[in-house]
Amino acid sequence: SGPLPKPSLQALPSSLVPLEKPVTLRCQGPPGVDLYRLEKLSSSRYQDQAVLFIPAMKRSLAGRYRCSYQNGSLWSLPSDQLELVATGVFAKPSLSAQPGPAVSSGGDVTLQCQTRYGFDQFALYKEGDPAPYKNPERWYRASFPIITVTAAHSGTYRCYSFSSRDPYLWSAPSDPLELVVT
């Protein structure tokens, strides 16, 4: 009959967790599951419960997680991996808009994330997008051109910097930048 369908794994309230702040990992399978297994990859950490409450985020808890469940003698496929990121590990970068934070509809603007440190990766996200509990998109450069701006691009932006050597240890978020489309 094949393996059972994979469960979902989410971090509440977010998979971006400031150091010392709490987060809950929740594995969700179908009703009547006999046993859950939630594990941190590349470690020996695991538990046989669906919910993991982390009362205070630490560097050592950042990383990739997944879960599965058992019904009878059958195990499910593993969930999609969840990347749990510790933020506030490094000083915040600065975020600016070129030529400026006010741009006409149809114009171009570039958001630049800058840091004093030698980080090689940056993450930019817009408040409310992407959906809650989902990692912001990662970009491997410090410039984020937005071509042919529309009203949908207006909003509050923040960026993070981090190193590819420790991809789950991020800086504090930059101060917010309000992009205004006129």
């Epitope: 941190k40 470690s43 020996s44 950490r45 695991y46 538990q47 993991l52 409450f53 982390i54 009362p55 205070a56 630490k58 050592s60 808890l61």
Partner: nanobody
Framework: QVQLQESGGGLVQPGGALRLSCAAS????????IGWFRQAPGKEREAVSC????????YYADSVKGRFTISRDNAKNTVYLQMNSLKPEDTAVYYC??????????????????WGQGTQVTVSS
């Protein structure tokens, strides 16, 4: 704020006894395994004893078996390490640690997320 605070260390003569306490604040210890670890000057940190949350099962390093006893009082959110028949080689800084993943015994010290600041135990005549 999640904190572990050790107390009870001090200077004691060989053959003496001490009782170390590890008090938790900011979260409840009920669900977590607790480990006691120690680090002597110039040496690596080593596991001394661990206790599970589920059934109270315990682990002891060979060097302390029969002399040390670990226990927990969930009502007081505290774990204890009773150390009897102390020897000079027990001299070290003693740390307690816990981790949100562990309800069963796990004495791999490098994988504990939460650590206390440590309490000094010196055994000397």
């Amino acid at each position: 704020q999640v904190q572990l605070q050790e107390s009870g260390g001090g200077l004691v003569q060989p053959g003496g006894a001490l009782r170390l306490s590890c008090a938790a604040s900011g979260f409840t210890l009920d669900y977590y395994a607790i480990g006691w670890f120690r680090q002597a000057p110039g040496k690596e940190r080593e596991a001394v004893s661990c206790i599970s949350s589920s059934d109270g099962s315990t682990y002891y390093a060979d060097s302390v078996k029969g002399r040390f006893t670990i226990s927990r009082d969930n009502a007081k959110n505290t774990v204890y390490l009773q150390m009897n028949s102390l020897k000079p080689e027990d001299t070290a800084v003693y740390y307690c640690a816990t981790d949100p993943f562990y309800s069963d015994i796990n004495c791999k010290s490098y994988e504990y997320a939460y650590w206390g600041q440590g309490t000094q135990v010196t055994v000397s005549s």
